[in-house]
């Protein structure tokens, strides 16, 4: 699996999508977990609905929500009130009995500022990056246009 | 065993600009993020920043946001901060430390040995 | 930014005695979402880099002695040394853990009588 790399920053909401067969996913609820260590188990943060039919409802725990779109296919984490210690490595996970299929890799990554990012100083809008091996950026940031900036539309 | 091994103390003329290293061995470099921070003499500590070294993303604290860039090159597993307009206010030890959690930007688990930088002409 | 405060700024005591010393945060360092305390006790000893001794205000990094417990909540926090050694003189420091940009109490010198 690559890994996808979301962005946010500290104290805003940070939005996490993965897409999924609907088709061949049909049936199965949904999780979302933090990666621990390179070897170490991936700690269930929160799943979808007990039934699978409501699985559209958003379900919380603490700060993070979990909503799934069983029919187009995606499955949706909301982070809410981001922190510095939310940065991390997760995984979207499809369940099946005990066992559990990873739908995406997620590499968390929060921002003390909407402008810092890989290249100090540089104005960046968020996209996807081919700069590191197996990773791209998904667009994730928001941030407020400057006074006299001109509207750009977000890559993807 | 994890290590930070930092380079060496350096005497610097003020104005001038200085790039300081601190390389990593005993785990995977990438899996952990590094953090610099600045200890004056017999003072407190102050975060200067972060380095992701698997993509590269940075945060700073505001106070040291051009004062300070952190870079990584991950073939040699070694971190790299660049201070410049070096003044006697940034005479100080210079610490790089390891974050405690996996992918994550939390804790100083594991501290290098320090640069001390002094500025004098 | 959250600013870290530490008292006493210094303190000497003789080897077996016990130990106490305040940090305060100028903001919450606990996570409603989790519950957790983001806070961090650091041990620097003379002409060292600073040591991870305690995290999340209560739990000790592991090879950390058990004479040393981190405890409190919110606002304030406390690093007890249930019985000092000669070893544990230096300089401690607190850390919010919490939020950018992290900070330090500014320290607790140890001394030993």
């Known amino acids: 699996h690559n890994t996808t790399v979301f962005q946010g920053v500290a104290g805003q909401s940070l939005q996490v999508s993965c897409p999924y067969d609907s088709m061949k996913h049909w049936g199965r609820r949904k999780a979302w977990c933090r990666q621990l260590g390179e070897k170490g188990p991936c700690q269930r943060v929160v799943s979808t609905h007990n039934l699978w039919l409501l699985s559209f409802l958003r379900r919380w725990n603490g700060s993070t929500a979990i909503t799934d779109d069983t029919l187009g296919g995606t499955l949706t984490i909301t982070l809410r009130n981001l922190q510095p210690h939310d940065a991390g490595l997760y995984q979207c996970q499809s369940l099946h009995g005990s066992e559990a299929d990873t739908l995406r890799k997620v590499l968390v990554e929060v921002l003390a500022d909407p402008l810092d990012h890989r290249d100090a100083g540089d104005l960046w809008f968020p996209g996807e990056s081919e700069s590191f091996e197996d990773a791209h950026v998904e667009h994730s940031i928001s941030r407020s246009l400057l006074e006299g900036e001109i509207p750009f539309p977000p890559t993807s | 065993e994890v290590q930070l091994q930092q380079s060496g103390p350096v005497l610097v003329k003020p104005g001038a600009s200085l790039k300081m290293s601190c390389r990593a061995s005993g785990y995977t470099f990438t899996d952990y993020y590094v953090h610099w921070v600045k200890q004056s003499h017999g003072k407190s500590l102050e975060w200067i920043g972060l380095?992701?070294?698997?993509?590269?993303?940075?945060s700073y604290n505001q106070r040291f946001k051009g004062k300070a860039t952190l870079t990584v090159d991950k073939s040699s597993s070694t971190a790299y901060m660049e201070v410049n307009s070096l003044t006697s206010e940034d005479s100080a030890v210079y610490y790089c430390?390891?974050?405690?959690?996996?992918?994550?930007?939390?804790?100083?688990?594991?501290w290098g040995q320090g640069t001390l930088v002094t500025v004098s002409a | 930014d959250i600013v870290m405060t530490q008292s006493p700024s210094s303190l000497s005591v003789s080897a077996g005695e016990k130990v106490t010393m305040s940090c305060k945060s100028s903001?919450?360092?606990?996570?409603?979402?989790?519950?957790?305390?983001?806070l961090a006790w650091y041990q620097q000893k003379p002409g060292q880099p600073p040591k991870l001794l305690i995290y999340?205000?209560?739990t000790r990094e592991s090879g950390v002695p058990d004479r040393f417990t981190g405890s409190g909540s919110g606002t304030d926090f406390t690093l007890t040394i249930s019985s000092v050694q000669a070893e544990d003189l230096a300089v401690y420091y607190c850390q919010n853990d919490h939020s950018y940009p992290y900070t330090f109490g500014g320290g607790t010198k140890l001394e030993i009588k």
């Open positions: 430390a390891r974050s405690r959690v996996y992918y994550g930007s939390s804790l100083f688990a594991f």
């Open positions: 999340g205000a209560s």
């Open positions: 903001q919450s360092l606990l996570n409603s979402g989790n519950q957790k305390n983001y």
């Open positions: 380095i992701n070294p698997y993509t590269g993303t940075t």
